[in-house]
């Protein structure tokens, strides 16, 4: 009896440029004789429905059709047919199929590979063309993938114990695609410093599929003027 097991949930998520291991475990009723086994990995792109061979292993032959692709013969002895792909790129996302043939038995499994890129975030103060006591803060998020991203602005005044989401005077621009396939976006907050309490902390909060916790960049209103804080992307303590 031959069985193949892939990543639970059927999806693997990996960061862009990572050396990814796509899991495939073989379960066989007898000890695995790799000389009598054939392992083939296939890839189907998200954009077109054609399956392409990525790697094959049988007997003493192994061939990578994607540069750097490898299945470890040592691990294969213990039933681990996982495929290692160094420097994974965005366009390599899609469906990967692990096909195993041992003697007269065959089994296969598929997994979806998602490649994500985490945004970098920075705060900029733009006072050009602004009125007296008015400032524009720009929160730039760059190099992220996929395109879906959520940018919000929050403030916490001196007196209140928790942040408050700001919806007025916020404009988030369109996402712009970079040459490498990643995206950039800028969100702007317009502030009238004369109407705000000194000591109020503002932060731009970026939420994206690639992030376990939101990316935060903050600044504090000082009595004199707004000051960008020393530490952008601070942790949120509570």
């Amino acid at each position: 009896d031959l069985k193949v097991e892939m990543m639970a949930g059927g999806t693997q998520i990996t960061p862009l440029n990572d050396n990814v291991t796509i899991f495939c475990n073989i379960f066989y009723s007898q000890p695995l004789n790799i000389a009598a086994a054939a392992i083939t990995w296939f890839w189907k792109s998200l954009t077109f429905d054609k399956e392409v061979k990525v790697f094959e292993f049988f007997g003493d032959h192994q061939e990578a059709f994607r540069p750097g692709a490898i299945v470890s013969p040592w691990r294969l002895k213990s039933g681990d047919a996982s495929l290692r792909l160094p420097g994974i790129q965005l366009e390599e996302a899609g469906e990967y199929r692990c096909e195993v043939v041992v003697a007269a038995a065959a089994a296969q499994g598929t997994v979806q590979l998602e490649v994500v890129a985490s945004p970098a975030s920075r705060l900029l103060l733009d006072q050009v063309g602004m009125k007296e006591n008015e400032d524009k803060y720009m929160c730039e998020s760059s190099g992220f993938y996929p395109e879906a991203i959520n940018i919000t602005w929050e403030k916490q005044t001196q007196k209140f114990p928790h942040p408050i989401e700001i919806s007025e005077d916020v404009i988030t621009g369109p996402t712009i695609k970079n040459m490498d396939g990643t995206f950039n976006v800028t969100s702007c907050l317009k502030l009238n410093s004369s109407q705000e309490d000194p000591g109020t902390v503002y932060q731009c909060v970026v939420r994206h599929a690639s992030l376990h916790t939101p990316l935060r960049s903050n600044f504090t209103l000082t009595a004199a003027r707004h000051s960008l804080s020393e530490t952008e992307k601070t942790d949120n303590f509570s």
């Epitope: 916490q156 007196k159 903050n218 942790d235 509570s238």
Partner: antibody, heavy 117, light 107 residues
């Protein structure tokens, strides 16, 4: 990291007064507002009042006006709450809480006040 | 004063279950609601702010929802350490007010 130090427990007689302290460290003390909360077993939490830590502003829950007085000693980064004319109903855990330099609130470990004859 | 009502003082659940703690405000508080967890002998710890935003470090099994007057804290895949007390708090205006608390206990 913000830390708020409070004495663990205080025992006082009915009718007496008591001063509870809350010493802050790990952030710019005078920039912020300090709240005080009361918690009696099984009765949830109540906001007593708050004080701006440069000492120039206080705010009280109507229910605690005349009962609680908040003061601050900036030199020792300590906030005080004086409770007067104590009764058994004043037996509770009292917490100080502040925003600190980042988002979210920080709580002291609380002082258990026991009013008993 | 704004009254925050947590109608259930106790709720029974099992490890691995999903449980929802509810809170009702006596008037519209927008999204200005926080949820606290308090373990015995400890001070309260904020989990959620703005009704649905998790503080960093809070496990994603904790989810807040609601706006206006009705709010919910949902815990999916309840862990043994989650079996404790939860409070809601409004912070749209002073005096800050809290719900009376809901204690999660083992079924």
């Amino acid at each position: 990291q913000v830390q708020l130090q409070q004495p663990g427990s205080v025992l006082v007689r009915p009718g007496a007064s008591v001063r509870l302290s809350c010493k802050a460290s790990g952030y710019t003390f005078t920039n912020y507002w300090m709240n005080w909360m009361k918690q009696r077993p099984g009765q949830g939490l109540e906001w007593i009042g708050g004080i701006y830590l440069n000492g120039d502003s206080t705010d009280y829950n109507e229910k605690f006006k005349g009962k609680a007085t908040l003061t601050v000693d900036t030199s020792s980064s300590t906030t005080y709450m004086d409770l007067s004319s104590l009764t058994y109903e004043d037996s509770a855990v009292y917490y100080c809480t502040t925003r600190g330099d980042y988002f979210g609130d920080f709580w002291g470990q609380g002082t258990t006040l026991t009013v008993s004859s | 004063d704004i009254v925050m009502t947590q109608s259930q003082k106790f709720m029974s659940t099992s490890v691995g279950d999903r449980v929802s703690v509810t809170c009702k405000a006596s008037q519209n508080v927008g999204k200005y609601v926080a949820w606290y967890q308090q373990k015995p002998g400890q001070s309260p710890k904020a989990l959620i702010y703005s009704a649905s935003n998790r503080y960093d470090g809070v496990p994603d099994r904790f989810t807040g929802s609601g706006s206006g007057t009705d709010f919910t804290l949902t815990i999916t895949n309840v862990q043994s350490e989650d079996l404790t007390e939860y409070f809601c708090q409004q912070y749209i205006s002073y005096p800050l007010t809290f719900g009376a608390g809901t204690k999660l206990e083992l079924k």
